[in-house]
Interface confidence: low
Amino acid sequence: ELPKPYISSNNSNPIEDKDAVTLTCEPVAENTTYLWWVNNQSLSVSPRLQLSNGNRILTLLSVTRNDTGPYECGIQNSESAKRSDPVTLNVTYGPDTPIISPPDLSYRSGANLNLSCHSDSNPSPQYSWLINGTLRQHTQVLFISKITSNNNGAYACFVSNLATGRNNSIVKNISVSSGDSAPGSSGLSASGSGSGLNDIFEAQKIEWHHHHHH
């Protein structure tokens, strides 16, 4: 009898664009054909996907967030066929360049400022807000009630993924008008990624990591 196969992996939590993953269909069986399925479809070999050892070993040369699977392997001989339970990869990735919402850059004096930051990341990233280069809080949402012209400035959302060791940020220049006219939507927006953060955030990056690890 053919045993029900199972998949072993050398790395179930690979990092996107960095790690390779080897999936092995177990056990070794003689006079047996090995088959693979990804997302319920027969495997299509590509430059990033390699089969070896008589199709028993599947190698993903550089994983992406789209490579989670599920993966199944099958074994068959002239008498029967068996298929493994599915295995999924927990691909860690990001954080992508964050998005601050709402997109408004101009606010009326006395209004509430309620900014939310989101970055695609696995696992979810750590969020921090910096205002004019000063670290304010470690939350995904920044709320300031009854803003005034004193609240003008550069609002930066900084995201960090400790699993990938990567970080990212975006800056929005927000202005507060004291007039009665409706505020316009003009303004400047800049984003920084990884080590390319603006100089004013460098000290805060160090402080943030220090704060997080201790």
């Epitope: 053919l2 045993p3 029900k4 997302n39 599920p70 029967s80 068996k82 339970d85 599915p86």
Partner: antibody, heavy 120, light 107 residues
Framework: EVQLQESGGVLVKPGGSLKLSCAAS????????MSWVRQTPEKRLEWVAY????????YFPDTVQGRFTVSRDNAKNTLYLQMNSLKSEDTAIYYC?????????????WGQGTLVTVSA | DIQMTQSPASLSASVGETVTITCRAS??????LAWYQQKQGKSPQLLVY???TLAEGVPSRFSGSGSGTQFSLKINSLQPEDFGSYYC?????????FGSGTKLEIK
């Protein structure tokens, strides 16, 4: 035509034991993984046992683990379910089911069921 | 264990109508979902597996869709023989679990 015929369902007291059988015909029984699925009086379906085509691999849910065993005799085209330490919540219609060939997933063929009642 | 939540618990419809039954998984099951039909006093019969693949002999008025955690079974132009109970089941490894069922009755 695929046929699965369960038997052995009776009234049994709590703590008692019972062995169900499922006679298969109309397909190559020895090539198919098999399961037992039960349907409670509330009409809920619950999977209770799995056995690979050759009988070497079995799986059970936590609710019956250690109390139920599953076996098969491919020479006789028969599947068995041994149920020990029966509880009132084991009362159900028990179906044997054949998985899709080469798969441990969906249940392609079902028997007509046999009623097991556990009551004092 | 993966929990399967099915809705509605019951619905009434007339011959010729189109109905949809939904099933939600407590975690990502990709496309590993099956649907069964059960008529009164009979055993369940496989309708659909792998979310949308019709089992042998199942009429094309049945169709399955969805992925991840949200799935649905649609029956176009209901026929008298379609009335009964319907169950979803994940086949994303053991333990296999079923939804609580949807009873489809004639209006």
């Amino acid at each position: 035509e695929v046929q699965l015929q369960e038997s052995g369902g009776v009234l049994v007291k709590p703590g008692g034991s019972l062995k169900l059988s499922c006679a298969a015909s109309g397909f190559v029984f020895s090539s198919y993984d098999m399961s037992w699925v039960r349907q409670t009086p509330e009409k809920r379906l619950e999977w209770v046992a799995y056995i690979s085509s050759g009988g070497g691999i079995t799986y059970f849910p936590d609710t019956v683990q250690g109390r139920f065993t599953v076996s098969r005799d491919n020479a006789k085209n028969t599947l068995y379910l041994q149920m020990n330490s029966l509880k009132s919540e084991d009362t159900a219609i028990y179906y044997c089911a054949a998985h899709y060939f080469g798969s441990s997933g969906p249940f392609a063929y079902w028997g007509q069921g046999t009623l097991v009642t556990v009551s004092a | 264990d993966i929990q399967m939540t099915q809705s509605p618990a019951s619905l009434s419809a007339s011959v010729g109508e189109t109905v949809t039954i939904t099933c939600r998984a407590s975690e990502n099951i990709f496309s590993y979902l099956a649907w069964y039909q059960q008529k009164q006093g009979k055993s369940p019969q496989l309708l659909v597996y792998n979310t949308k693949t019709l089992a042998e002999g199942v009429p094309s008025r049945f169709s399955g869709s969805g992925s991840g955690t949200q799935f649905s079974l649609k029956i176009n132009s209901l026929q008298p023989e379609d009335f009964g109970s319907y169950y979803c089941q994940h086949h994303y490894g053991t333990p296999f679990t079923f939804g609580s069922g949807t009873k489809l009755e004639i209006k």
